[in-house]
C-alpha cells in the first residue's frame, strides 16, 4: 500500500542534520609499512570564494614512539583559511601558498606545491614515498586524518570512486544533509517520527554509527519515534536528550550505558517502506527524513515538538547568513613581513570581502603612515626608523590600526619584527633537573638535561625546539633526540619550559659497542614563533654545542653505536 506523505525540504530552523563520514567521492588507502615517510594526499574542492577548514592530524603512539615522518599534500581549488592541528607530529606540509592561509602559524615544515593536475600531484607526492592515503573531498568543513591507521589491502594507492577511507580519514561536509518532512495522511495525534537512513558504504566491515538527537522541547511535550535504518553491519549508539521510542535495524545501545546492546528489527530499506513503518507506529508527522552516506557520527537538531510541520518549498539556505564583520578575525588576517630593515603589513582584499568588512583605513600607530591600495591587497610599509616604530634590543614594535565602516572606534593590533642582529641563541647542558650548573660533559647511563635560551628574551614570541640530534662522529653515528617537536624514543623526554619559557628536555645515552666516542656535537633547530599573527614571522636557527663523553657503560637503553 502506498503511504501518502509528500516529503518536502524542511527549513534549517525546523531541523538540521550534520554528519561525519569516511565515505569519499574518490579515494584510496594503501599499506606502506616499511616507508620512512607516510604520505597522504588531499584534493579539496570548495565552492568559489574563501572557505574555512579545520584539519586535524592524529597519531597513535606505536611501540611507545611517535610515528614516522608525515608528508601531507594539500591540493585546493580556491582560497582556504586553514586551522591546522598536528601536535607533536613530524609533519611536512606541501600546499599552494597563494590559496591556503593559516589562521595561526602552522609550526611545521612547509613546501610549495607545484601547480599540477591531480595525476601529476599524485606522482609528485609518490616520488617522495609510497602514498598511504589519497582522497577527494567536496566542500569539507573539517577533516580528521589518523596516521598509522592504514588498513588497505594493496601496497599502492589508486584513486577509485566512492571509497570508504575506514579509520584513516573522517570528514564533515559543510553543507548539512537534506532534511525532508511530511504529514502522514489519515493519522490523528501529535506523534512525530525522525527517520534516518544510512546508505551502504563501499566496505562492509562492522560499524557503529553514533546518533546524537537534540530536540528543543520540554520533555513532557514530546511523543516521538526515532527510526534508524542501515545496512546489516551497522549498529547504533544513541545519544538523545529526550525519551523516545526507538526503532532500528541491527543492534543499538544508549550512550549512558553503552555496553547494553538491544536487538533491533528488520526494517524496509526504501523510503516508502520507512514512511509506512512510521505510520504503523502511529506517527502523524515525519518531522525529519534524512538519507546519508555511511557515517560515523550523525547529529540531528530539531525543534518540531509534535507541532505544526513547516516545510520550505524554496531551496533552503544551508549556512546562516553572515552579514556582520568580525573585527577579531579581520585583524588576524593582517600579515606581517620583516625584511630589509622595514616592516610590511599586507591585507588581502578577497579575505576582507569574505568577512563582509568594509575598510576605510589601514595605518600604523602614526596615522600619517597609510596603506597603499594595490588592487588585490592593502600594503602598509615603513622603515624601522619611522612611523612611530618602537625599537628595543630584541624587537621592533608598532600598532596596526584599521578603521572599519561597521565600527565607530578603530581596531588595533600589536605588530612586531625581530631584531635578529641582536638576538643570540644558546644551548645549555646540565647534569641535574634543577638546571643550575652548566656542563659540557655527558656520561653514558646518566641523564643529561638541555635548555635552549634566546637573549635578550622576546615576550611576544614563543621559543620552540623543532629538532635535536647528537652527532657522535663516524663510530657513533647520529642519535635523533627530537623530531617535529616530539621526543624520539623512550630515553628522551620533553620537559616543562623554564619560568621564562625556555624549552627543556632530558636524554639518556647508552652505548652497546666500543670504542665509545670521546666527543659529540649536540645540534638543535629552534624556532621563534609569534604568539599571535602569521607564520611569515617565524625565525629558525640551528644551535650547536660540543660535548665531551666520559666513562663507559655497556648496559641499557637507546643509542646508535
Amino acid at each position: 500500500e502506498t503511504v501518502h506523505c509528500d516529503l518536502q525540504p524542511v527549513g534549517p530552523e525546523r531541523g538540521e542534520v550534520t554528519y561525519t563520514t569516511s565515505q569519499v567521492s574518490k579515494g584510496c588507502v594503501a599499506q606502506a609499512p616499511n616507508a620512512i615517510l607516510e604520505v597522504h594526499v588531499l584534493f579539496l574542492e570548495f565552492p568559489t570564494g574563501p572557505s574555512q577548514l579545520e584539519l586535524t592530524l592524529q597519531a597513535s603512539k606505536q611501540n611507545g614512539t611517535w610515528p614516522r615522518e608525515v608528508l601531507l599534500v594539500l591540493s585546493v581549488n580556491s582560497s582556504v583559511f586553514l586551522h591546522l592541528q598536528a601536535l607533536g607530529i613530524p609533519l611536512h606540509l606541501a600546499y599552494n601558498s597563494s590559496l591556503v592561509t593559516f589562521q595561526e602559524p602552522p609550526g611545521v615544515n612547509t613546501t610549495e606545491l607545484p601547480s599540477f593536475p591531480k595525476t601529476q600531484i599524485l606522482e609528485w607526492a609518490a616520488e617522495r614515498g609510497p602514498i598511504t592515503s589519497a582522497a577527494e573531498l567536496n566542500d569539507p568543513q573539517s577533516i580528521l586524518l589518523r596516521l598509522g591507521q592504514a588498513q588497505g589491502s594493496l601496497s599502492f594507492c589508486m584513486l577509485e570512486a566512492s571509497q570508504d577511507m575506514g579509520r584513516t580519514l573522517e570528514w564533515r561536509p559543510r553543507t548539512p544533509a537534506l532534511v525532508r518532512g511530511c504529514h502522514l495522511e489519515g493519522v490523528a495525534g501529535h506523534k512525530e517520527a525522525h527517520i534516518l537512513r544510512v546508505l551502504p558504504g563501499h566496505s562492509a566491515g562492522p560499524r557503529t554509527v553514533t546518533v546524537k538527537v537534540e530536540l528543543s522541547c520540554a520533555p513532557g511535550d514530546l511523543d516521538a519515534v526515532l527510526i534508524l535504518q542501515g545496512p546489516p553491519y551497522v549498529s547504533w549508539l544513541i545519544d538523545a536528550n529526550h525519551n523516545m521510542q526507538i526503532w532500528t535495524t541491527g543492534e543499538y545501545s544508549f550512550k549512558i550505558f553503552p555496553e547494553k546492546n538491544i536487538r533491533g528489527f528488520k526494517l524496509p530499506d526504501t523510503p516508502q517502506g520507512l514512511l509506512g513503518e512510521a505510520r504503523m507506529l502511529n506517527a502523524s508527522i515525519v518531522a525529519s527524513f534524512v538519507e546519508l552516506p555511511l557515517a560515523s557520527i550523525v547529529s540531528l537538531h530539531a525543534s518540531s515538538c509534535g507541532g505544526r510541520l513547516q516545510t520550505s518549498p524554496a531551496p533552503i539556505q544551508t549556512t546562516p547568513p553572515k552579514d556582520t564583520c568580525s573585527p577579531e578575525l579581520l585583524m588576524s588576517l593582517i600579515q606581517t613581513k620583516c625584511a630589509d630593515d622595514a616592516m610590511t603589513l599586507v591585507l588581502k582584499k578577497e579575505l576582507v570581502a569574505h568577512l563582509k568588512c568594509t575598510i576605510t583605513g589601514l595605518t600604523f600607530w602614526d596615522p600619517s603612515c597609510e596603506a597603499e591600495d594595490r588592487g588585490d591587497k592593502f600594503v602598509l610599509r615603513s622603515a624601522y626608523s619611522s612611523c612611530g616604530m618602537q625599537v628595543s634590543a630584541s624587537m621592533i614594535s608598532n600598532e596596526a590600526v584599521v578603521n572599519i565602516l561597521s565600527s565607530s572606534s578603530p581596531q588595533r593590533k600589536k605588530v612586531h619584527c625581530l631584531n635578529m642582529d641582536s638576538l643570540s641563541f644558546q644551548l645549555g647542558l646540565y647534569l641535574s633537573p634543577h638546571f643550575l650548573q652548566a656542563s659540557n660533559t655527558i656520561e653514558p647511563g646518566q641523564q643529561s638535561f638541555v635548555q635552549v635560551r634566546v637573549s635578550p628574551s622576546v615576550s611576544e614570541f614563543l621559543l620552540q625546539l623543532d629538532s635535536c640530534h647528537l652527532d657522535l662522529g663516524p663510530e657513533g653515528g647520529t642519535v635523533e633526540l627530537i623530531q617535529g617537536r616530539a621526543a624520539k624514543g623512550n630515553c628522551v623526554s620533553l620537559l616543562s619550559p623554564s619560568p621564562e619559557g625556555d624549552p627543556r628536555f632530558s636524554f639518556l645515552l647508552h652505548f652497546y659497542t666500543v670504542p665509545i666516542p670521546k666527543t659529540g656535537t649536540l645540534s638543535c633547530t629552534v624556532a621563534l614563533r609569534p604568539k599571535t599573527g602569521s607564520q611569515d614571522q617565524e625565525v629558525h636557527r640551528t644551535v650547536f654545542m660540543r660535548l665531551n663523553i666520559i666513562s663507559p657503560d655497556l648496559s641499557g637503553c637507546t643509542s646508535k653505536g
Epitope: T119, E123, A126, E127, P130, F156
Partner: antibody, heavy 118, light 112 residues
C-alpha cells in the same frame, strides 16, 4: 645518450606469467617515472602503469590492477613489468618509456613481443 | 577515464599535401590553474616505438620538423602536417595526461 633496452621476445602459455625487463642508461634512473605501454597487433597504445624508481611508488590502470606488477632494481638501473594469469588477448608488444615532467614520453624502449598461445 | 577519439582512422594523401588529423576528448584536458592542455601527439612507424612530436597541445618537441604543428584547446585538437614528406607516412596517436594516461585509437596516414 639516453637509452632504454628491453629484454627479448617471449612465448607463454595461457595462465602463465611473463616478466619483461628494461635497462636504462644515459640519465639518472631514480629521477624519472618509468611507464609501461602495450600495443596489441594492429591496435592502438594502451597504458599499463608507472613506477618511480626513486621511491618504488607505483600506479596502475584499473584494467591491470592485481595482474601487473612493476618493480625496479636501482643497482642495475633496470625496470621490470610482470604480467600474471596471461590470456591470449595479452599478446602484444610491451614498451617501457621514460616520462619527462614537461614534454611527456620522450624515450622509449624498442619493445618486447609477448605471445600468449596454447 | 578520459576517452580520446581520433578522426579519420585512415587517411590517404600525397607528398606535398597539407594534412589535418583531429582528436576529440570526452572531457576537457585544459588545466585551468596553468592554462595548459595536457595533450600530446606521437608518430609511430611499423615495427618501431612511438616518437613524441608535440606536447602541451601545441609545443613541438626539439628536433621535430616545423611542418608539424598542433592546435586546439579544451576538448578539440588538431595535428597539422603542412607539407607531407615521404618519411611522414605513419600512424599518429593523440595522448592525454591530465587524468591518468589514455591514447586515441590512432590515425593511419598512407600514401595515395
Amino acid at each position: 645518450q639516453v637509452q632504454l633496452v628491453q629484454s627479448g621476445a617471449e612465448v607463454k602459455k595461457p595462465g602463465a606469467s611473463v616478466k619483461v625487463s628494461c635497462k636504462a642508461s644515459g640519465y639518472t634512473f631514480t629521477s624519472y617515472w618509468m611507464h609501461w605501454v602495450r600495443q596489441a597487433p594492429g591496435q592502438g597504445l594502451e597504458w599499463i602503469g608507472n613506477i618511480y624508481p626513486g621511491s618504488g611508488s607505483t600506479f596502475y590502470d584499473e584494467k591491470f590492477k592485481g595482474r601487473a606488477t612493476l618493480t625496479v632494481d636501482t643497482s642495475i638501473s633496470t625496470a621490470y613489468m610482470e604480467l600474471s594469469r596471461l590470456r591470449s588477448d595479452d599478446t602484444a608488444v610491451y614498451y617501457c618509456t621514460r616520462r619527462n615532467y614537461v614534454t611527456g614520453f620522450d624515450y622509449w624502449g624498442q619493445g618486447t613481443t609477448v605471445t600468449v598461445s596454447s | 577515464d578520459i576517452q580520446l577519439t581520433q578522426s579519420p582512422s585512415f587517411l590517404s594523401a600525397s607528398v606535398g599535401d597539407r594534412v589535418t588529423i583531429t582528436c576529440k576528448s570526452s572531457q576537457s584536458v585544459l588545466y585551468s590553474s596553468n592554462q595548459k592542455n595536457y595533450l600530446a601527439w606521437y608518430q609511430q612507424k611499423p615495427g618501431k616505438a612511438p616518437k613524441l612530436l608535440i606536447y602541451w597541445a601545441s609545443t613541438r618537441e626539439s628536433g621535430v620538423p616545423s611542418r608539424f604543428s598542433g592546435s586546439g584547446s579544451g576538448t578539440e585538437f588538431t595535428l597539422t602536417i603542412s607539407s607531407l614528406q615521404p618519411e611522414d607516412f605513419a600512424t599518429y596517436y593523440c595522448h592525454q595526461y591530465l587524468s591518468s594516461y589514455t591514447f586515441g585509437q590512432g590515425t593511419k596516414l598512407e600514401i595515395k
